[in-house]
Interface confidence: low
Amino acid sequence: EDLKKVFPPKVAVFEPSEAEISHTQKATLVCLATGFYPDHVELSWWVNGKEVHSGVSTDPQPLKEQPALEDSRYSLSSRLRVSATFWHNPRNHFRCQVQFYGLSEDDEWTEDRDKPITQKISAEAWGRADC
Amino acid sequence: PYIQNPDPAVYQLRGSKSNDTSVCLFTDFDSVMNVSQSKDSDVHITDKTVLDMRSMDFKSNGAVAWSNKSDFACTSAFKDSVIPADTFFPSPESSC
């Protein structure tokens, strides 16, 4: 892989829709990792400092942002669904972490350059009381 | 998987003020429903995936659409998929 062309992801968490909460009594957070290349990423959800798997659904593979381009950057999405009660508890902390393997162009890594640096990029949200 | 009580809906999710990405969540639809890719290269739509809330013994299908286009709207995000009109839930402005 061309080490000169590595782009880490931008990560953002999107809050549940109040419409979903009132309609279903459930709350879905969406995590988007966008603009990364190559497509080696691992996405995980952490609730109150612990990794969670229940209620999580992540795209099986990253999506090419520009399918026509051979070297298109990639995106990945993931959903975390919890009960409305759990979301509305302001003490609850939700974090989406994307682990990205790669070397940036100006990296000062001094060991073997085949060994990837792990960059952890995360985005977070907190349970909301009535603001 | 078999979805017990499908209740298809499209919701608009809020990001931060400094994030110009709009996200639409299509969820709780029947497993026979397919989600089509967007013909607009600036609109990204994921394949459907299954989410399992094990503690509540509840499974749901979902797909996500997003775009940085200023005129992107959830009502048109999944226009290439067959979705009933009453599945769109407007997102009320937050007073926070």
């Epitope: 999107f14 977070e124 907190w126 | -």
Partner: nanobody
């Protein structure tokens, strides 16, 4: 809006200690996460330590065992206690705050730490 003002930087000898402070003002009730970052001359800004409103902390490998992040909610202040300082800790240290959902992102102007004999 949130304003962040750092202080406590200065010149210190290797092995010495400093305590940096970051005072937040404005919509501080919405902040749920604070971090200290640093930028050495000619290098990229890097994470030093994070603290959440639940007082969960997270440190960069280079800071573990030497630096401690803490906060005083009553004073809207976050601290970075730095011990066993090394020359490679020389950098401009920035305070960061995130509010409600990333990235409602705020940064201070920075305070300079110089470790030199």
């Amino acid at each position: 809006e949130v304003q962040l003002v750092e202080s406590g930087g200065g010149v210190v000898q290797p092995g010495g200690s400093l305590r940096l402070s970051c005072v937040a003002s404005g919509s501080v009730h919405k902040i749920n996460f604070y971090g200290w970052y640093r930028q050495a001359p000619g290098k990229e800004r890097e994470k030093v330590a994070h603290i959440s409103i639940g007082d969960q902390t997270d440190y960069a490998d280079s800071a573990k065992g030497r630096f401690t992040i803490s906060r005083d909610e009553s004073k809207n202040t976050v601290y970075l206690q730095m011990n066993s300082l090394r020359p490679e800790d020389t950098a401009l240290y920035y305070c960061r705050a995130l509010s409600r959902i990333w990235p409602y992102d705020y940064w201070g102007q920075g305070t300079l730490v110089t470790v030199s004999s």
